[in-house]
Interface confidence: low
């Protein structure tokens, strides 16, 4: 029907810096490039209806669903949500399309649903249908990746059975330690699967999708540089692929690598070599061993040796499901107001974990660090001195493992007091604990020195919100006391603090009653 | 209660495509991802596929990839499998089956499956 | 893909019988496996999820063993309903795979 409007429907991707609700917008925010979404005439319905192609959002994202129309004249719209109507305020473009937009930022469960878009322009009525889910990543798996040797070829396959279908991405370094941190201009990225060149440095292999990045490095020993103080040790699970890559490098080509596993040479088809010339004109060479599908007997000491340099060896161990090694015991610290501090677990794990610090019910990103000895450590620096329980915990695919530390913080007492018609209670928060002491002030003690025994409850209670302990004493109101001012001290190394409390009078005028007696 | 009825047995010529439907009820049709799984004759269950009901999204097994779609029609709880350039190997019981747990991975109801002859 | 092997291929049992069949996964699967049974022209039935966990209305003479690669499925006392062919299925990594089946016959 040449009477129907040229439709053009786009889905737009924000980065998140906002948070409302839905809203009808006629300018939306700046964002990535559109997505057509299609918008066909759905037959056989009743009217003119366009349907969009369905759209998946990721818990929290913003969007922006936009319609361009390039139809003569004005057009007046109307959205409908859930049988509620939003208003709609449709404006042209440069071309002089008319254009609608409806913002939904910080995508929740409630915004999921159809989007119903009335548009009456001047020579026709239509509908317009988005349909608005929240993408269900239960079924998604980010699989760390693993190698394989390429069917006739000198090369490393990296494969990640993850769902969706990941990016796989070589990172490679030439260079030594520091430097081939991630951002470091010695690292070069190739978004392949393929690997051919397999002589540098530090070869790595990363996967990502939608769920984040796992990233398998090459195992490797170099005859060219001093052995690290402990065994290298490399773990995998039965089932898993071998890969460990040896290299060294000589003035010519006149010498020869070999593997050994407990001093029995690898079996042909476990190995395989390559040869360079590097810049200098030296020799590059490098052996892999490797197994397809390790089993429990492929445990043991992997030595490589060369006719031309020190051999050096790696313990590989085959474990029938992963671990998480570490102490679990709690641990208790104390630091001063000021004092720089960070928590730290030292653990060794395989597959490598995924791990999160809490503190008061929030989560902090952790981060890992590999150590020389095979051990590796995760610390947590960012506590600001707020003093509780802090928690780490690890998990991979095969255990979990949860820490509790404990953090005080040095510090002079701070005191709140409350009275009711019966008592009087003080608190404070003041590390280490305070000890309480009661005083009666009047005409005979204006400076407050009379102590109170009588009558005191003292108690430590935890308040549940950082984990802290709270101290609190509560004095039971006597005759004796009543009507009188009474003075409640926290005290504790690193100071005192007081609070002045005027308890319920028995009478009318306690004073001047007990002034006359 | 949960059922998943197919549509019927259906004879193509190689070359030509077909369509299974199976149609869900007794439960949230959005709430259940649908997996295709088929069976040639005599032989063991093969996973062809998987379709997220509530946004369509899918993701199939690499031998069907360009061969297979996977459609959802949310307003009648129904799913579709549609597999192109059929050869004579595609002959087998289809069925669909809902996925549940992690990762979707328990298959726990299935349709009664749907005979597919491919023959000249 | 990850290869499943089940083992015997069909075996031959009287009723009151104890059956063990196994599957083994060519890697690692943690205890991402599921058992299932199919009678002739019928469609497969869910019996075990999770290497162990017995799927509701399933008699508790089907047990489910093993983690890692090597699982098992148990029958306790074979029953008349029970002659049919049994087949594992791990949903670790997608695609999820089938292993080749074990029929279980009359002897």
């Known amino acids: 029907n040449q009477d129907l409007p040229v439709i053009k429907c786009v889905l737009i991707n924000h980065k998140n810096n906002d948070s409302s609700v839905g809203k009808s917008s006629s300018y939306p925010m700046v964002s990535e490039s559109p997505e057509d979404l299609g918008c066909a005439l759905r037959p056989q319905s009743s009217g003119t209806v366009y349907e969009a192609a369905a759209v998946e959002v990721d818990v929290s994202a913003s969007i922006t669903l936009q319609v361009l129309v390039d139809a003569p004249g004005n057009i007046s719209c109307l959205w409908v949500f859930k049988h509620s109507s939003l208003n709609c305020q449709p404006h042209f473009d440069l071309q002089n399309r008319g254009v609608v937009s409806m913002v939904i930022l910080k995508m929740t469960e409630t915004q999921a649903g159809e989007y119903l878009l009335f548009i009456q322009s001047e020579a026709t009525n239509y509908t317009i249908l988005f349909t608005v889910s929240i993408r269900n990543t239960l079924l998604y798996t980010l699989r760390r990746p693993y190698f394989r040797k390429m069917e006739n070829q000198d090369a490393l396959v990296c494969i990640s059975e993850s769902v969706p279908e990941p990016i796989v991405e070589w990172v490679l370094c030439d260079s030594q330690g520091e430097s081939c941190k991630e951002e470091s201009p010695a690292v070069v990225k190739k978004e392949e699967k393929v690997l051919h060149e397999l002589f540098g440095t530090d070869i790595r292999c990363c996967a990502r999708n939608e769920l984040g990045r796992e990233c398998t490095r090459l195992f490797t020993i170099d005859l060219n540089q001093t052995p690290q103080t402990t065994l290298p040790q490399l773990f995998l699970k039965v089932g898993e692929p071998l890969w460990i890559r040896c290299k060294a490098v000589h003035v010519n080509h006149g010498f020869g690598l070999t593997w050994e596993l407990e001093n029995k040479a690898l079996e042909e088809g476990n190995y395989f070599e390559m040869s360079t010339y590097s810049t200098n004109r030296t020799m590059i060479r490098i052996l892999f061993a490797f197994v397809s599908s390790v089993a429990r007997n492929d445990t043991g000491y992997y030595t490589c040796s060369s006719s031309k340099h020190p051999s050096q060896s790696a313990l590989v161990t085959i474990v029938e499901k992963g671990f998480i090694n570490a102490t679990n015991s709690s641990e208790d610290y104390e630091i001063d107001q000021y004092e720089e501090f960070c928590f730290s677990v030292r653990f060794k794990a395989y597959p490598q974990i995924r791990c999160t610090w809490t503190f008061s019910r929030k989560s902090f990103p952790c981060e890992q660090k590999g150590l020389d000895n095979g051990y590796s450590i995760s610390k947590f620096c960012n506590h600001k001195h707020q003093p509780g329980e802090y928690i780490f915990h690890a998990e991979n695919d095969d255990a979990q493992f949860t820490k509790m530390f404990t953090l005080n913080i040095r510090r002079k007492p701070q005191v709140l007091a409350e009275a009711s018609a019966s008592q009087a209670s003080c608190f404070s928060d003041g590390y280490p604990l305070p000890s309480w002491t009661w005083k009666k002030c009047s005409d005979k003690s204006p400076n407050c020195t009379e102590e109170i025994t009588e009558g005191v409850w003292n108690r430590k209670a935890n308040r549940k919100v950082f984990g802290q302990w709270v101290s609190s004493s509560t004095l039971n109101m006597s005759e004796a006391i009543k009507g009188f001012l009474v003075k409640c001290c926290a005290y504790n190394s690193l100071g005192t603090s007081c609070e002045t409390i005027l308890l319920n009078s028995p009478g009318p005028f306690p004073f001047i009653q007990d002034n006359i007696s | 209660q949960v059922q998943l009825v197919q549509s019927g047995a259906e004879v193509k010529k190689p070359g030509a495509s077909v369509k299974v439907s199976c149609k869900a009820s007794g439960y949230t049709f959005t709430k259940y991802y649908m997996h295709w799984v088929r069976q040639a004759p005599g032989q063991g269950l093969e996973w062809m596929g998987i379709?997220?009901?509530?946004?369509?999204?899918?993701s199939y097994a690499q031998k069907f990839q360009g061969r297979v779609t996977m459609t959802r029609d949310t307003s009648t709880s129904t799913v579709y499998m549609e597999l192109s350039s059929l050869r004579s190997e595609d002959t087998a019981v289809y069925y669909c089956?809902?996925?549940?747990?992690?990762?979707?991975?328990?298959?726990?109801?299935w349709g009664q499956g749907t005979l597919v002859t491919v023959s000249s | 893909d990850i290869q499943m092997t089940q083992s015997p291929s069909s075996l031959s049992a009287s009723v009151g019988d104890r059956v063990t069949i196994t599957c083994r996964a060519s890697q690692s699967i943690s205890s991402s496996l599921n058992w299932y049974q199919q009678k002739p022209g019928k469609a497969p039935k869910l019996l075990i999820y999770?290497?162990?966990s017995l799927e509701s209305g399933v008699p508790s003479r089907f047990s489910g063993s093993g983690s890692g690669t090597d699982f098992t499925l148990t029958i306790s006392s074979l029953q008349p309903e029970d002659f049919a062919t049994y087949y594992c299925q791990q949903y670790y990594s997608y695609p999820p795979t089938f292993g080749g089946g074990t029929k279980v016959e009359i002897k």
């Open positions: 379709i997220n009901p509530s946004g369509g999204s899918t």
């Open positions: 999770k290497a162990s």
């Open positions: 089956a809902r996925g549940r747990g992690y990762s979707y991975g328990y298959l726990d109801y």
